[in-house]
Amino acid sequence: MMTGTIETTGNISAEKGGSIILQCHLSSTTAQVTQVNWEQQDQLLAICNADLGWHISPSFKDRVAPGPGLGLTLQSLTVNDTGEYFCIYHTYPDGTYTGRIFLEVLESSVAEHGARFQIP
């Protein structure tokens, strides 16, 4: 039975040209995290594997930085980076947990972080 929950940074905004940290946290389970995939819509950005470390997809390698922790740092943001991001936790023996973050990249300097929320 899957008992865990994913906490994410929720809806966030950032300025064009700036950077943002995408963070998810898995709690309420003793399952072992074997891998975390970071996806934007249906495109894989990065993998953090417990044994193999980080794999950043080549088209993002120049502006995606691994971490902190299992999170992902997006740099040199453009308005095209606006959209949904997913953290997909592969765990053993539970299976897969998914968290969602919505990022809005703003032209203006008015960019405030949204509230944290949970996805069961």
Epitope: Q35, N49, H55
Partner: antibody, heavy 119, light 106 residues
């Protein structure tokens, strides 16, 4: 065309070390990850380890810790595998595949380098 | 390490036959399973990634399925150029390969 060119066959004595090279063309190795895979005669494939040429970060299969050292020279777009304290168990073909764009699978392989350890 | 068990060890077929090769993982690996073909004296060639995703340039007669611990590579109507070794590889933890299935001419 994306290719990986490997160095020629090596005949080495037990106890010695050897360094194999893998030169990329058609892409910049800093944009991907270079792996090394061992295949002994009539046997399966064994992953040795990988390197991120952009920062030199390496990971090795536990079995090859202390046996293998992976390095790169980004100026020549080349990756290297050094094997130390060679024994007959190290006689094998060594391949350098690059990781795929979306994970730890191998989409382009070098032709392989045969290493023979014999006195 | 995660152990991948391939079966059968060898398979004799006639061109035109359709075949299924099996790869079983010692623990769940989600869809982190990839398939390769290796012909004699050649390097391996990627056929399928992530259990079922096709690879550009690979004939459509090759397909993959499965998730968790059980995976299958199917070849629909084998051609003479398909004979050789087939290996599965997992990327859920330290990378490991199966021992292979040899596809040979009957």
């Amino acid at each position: 065309e994306v290719q990986l060119q490997q160095s020629g066959a090596e005949l080495v004595k037990p106890g010695a070390s050897v360094r194999l090279s893998c030169t990329a063309s058609g892409f910049n190795i800093k944009d991907t990850y270079i792996n090394w895979v061992k295949q002994r005669p009539e046997q399966g494939l064994e992953w040795i380890g990988r390197i991120d040429p952009a920062n030199g970060d390496t990971k090795y299969a536990p079995k090859f810790q202390g046996k293998a050292t992976i390095t790169t020279d980004t100026s020549s777009n080349t990756a290297y595998l050094q094997l130390s304290s060679l024994t007959s168990e190290d006689t094998a073909v060594y391949y350098c595949p690059k990781s795929g764009d979306y994970g730890w699978y191998f989409d382009v392989w070098g032709a392989g380098t045969t290493v023979t350890v014999s006195s | 390490d995660i152990v991948l068990t391939q079966s059968p060890a060898s398979l004799s077929v006639t061109p035109g036959d359709s075949v299924s090769l099996s790869c079983r993982a010692s623990q769940s690996i989600s869809n982190n399973l990839h398939w390769y073909q290796q012909k004699s004296h050649e390097s391996p060639r990627l056929l399928i990634k992530y259990a079922s995703q096709s690879i550009s340039g690979i004939p459509s007669r090759f397909s993959g399925s499965g998730s968790g611990t059980y995976f299958t590579l199917s070849i629909n109507s084998v051609e003479t150029e398909d004979f050789g070794m087939y290996f599965c590889q997992q990327s859920n933890s330290w990378l490991t390969f199966g021992a292979g299935t040899k596809l040979e001419l009957k």
